[in-house]
Amino acid sequence: EPHSLRYNLTVLSWDGSVQSGFLAEVHLDGQPFLRYDRQKCRAKPQGQWAEDVLGNKTWDRETRDLTGNGKDLRMTLAHIKDQKEGLHSLQEIRVCEIHEDNSTRSSQHFYYDGELFLSQNLETEEWTVPQSSRAQTLAMNVRNFLKEDAMKTKTHYHAMHADCLQELRRYLESGVVLRRTVPPMVNVTRSEASEGNITVTCRASSFYPRNIILTWRQDGVSLSHDTQQWGDVLPDGNGTYQTWVATRICRGEEQRFTCYMEHSGNHSTHPVPSGKVLVLQSHW
């Protein structure tokens, strides 16, 4: 998977008046990394691992960047003519990626009231607008404003692309993201299903990086894909991930089934608990 840095900023208007302040979150490799603290007007790391990325350096640079981006986005919202009664939001998502072959990608996306209306590839400067008439109108508004604003020249978009990649490389240089491996906690549980059957669920939690193999085996052989149900691999809010896999088996055959887990070059198998013990927890 590529390394990525994702900025997510939101500004609000109420009854046509753009509100002061903004919401901002930054994700590094898909994990919550920074957020803008509106009370303290500072960028704050999200958890210990995020603090470790910059070590003892301050977050002044991040604070300055987010503040500037928030100001720009408020000015953009002020130029949207669609403003009417009630609360409205303009959201900008900017993503840059560095792939294994060292190629890079970056893009920018604008959403109004949660609906995508404008995207730009920051490398080719190519704009994309969804087909809906509302999106077309909003996109025309915003693009006209960005064209008028002397700052938003070709140089500006190249700089946005370059700055994002520079920050991403800076974070990766710390080695924290690249080195980091957190093994999963694995839980196997059972629950009654239809008569004569039980559902067994294998949960892996608190692991990093995201890539994991989790599958049920019968007599040491992996079950077919269509006999298992998988959950998405999702961030758990602590800089790590969680997922699960479940299958239905005949009661009495529990000893034939194991949950197989493979993560960062390590693997382990986990048996189904007997009916009396509901949960078996292990950490390899």
Epitope: K84, E85, G86
Partner: nanobody
């Protein structure tokens, strides 16, 4: 019967202060975003301020830094503290429920209005 009643309007000199109250009966205000809008003679209605059930506040550009909206759920009342009043703040002020929605000024619950006049 569902009702919103405003009080606190009146005549005040430029630079003076007023506090408007919006009290609800027949329903619980704490579950609603409650806002104030105003209408001056010959002008369009203008949103003034809004407070959500979580306490987030929103203001029109023309009143930012001068007006403060607050709520007292125990008293089922929302307040609008108006400081540094200007002649252009002269209008009939209305409070209404559901001020985050895109047609809140025509929503089901809004009050009869209270006159605010700023003049020397």
């Amino acid at each position: 019967q569902v009702q919103l009643v405003e009080t606190g309007g009146g005549l005040v000199q430029p630079g003076g202060s007023l506090r408007l109250s919006c009290a609800a009966s027949g329903f619980t205000l704490e579950h609603y975003a409650i806002g104030w809008f105003r209408q001056a003679p010959g002008k369009e209605q203008e949103g003034v301020s809004c407070i959500t059930s979580d306490g987030d506040t929103y203001y029109a550009d023309s009143v930012k830094g001068r007006f403060t909206i607050s709520r007292d759920n125990a008293k089922n009342t929302v307040y609008l503290q108006m400081n540094s009043l200007k002649p252009e703040d002269t209008a009939v002020y209305y409070c209404a429920a559901d001020c985050l929605s895109s047609n809140w000024r025509t929503s089901a619950y809004w009050a009869q209005g209270t006159q605010v006049t700023v003049s020397s």
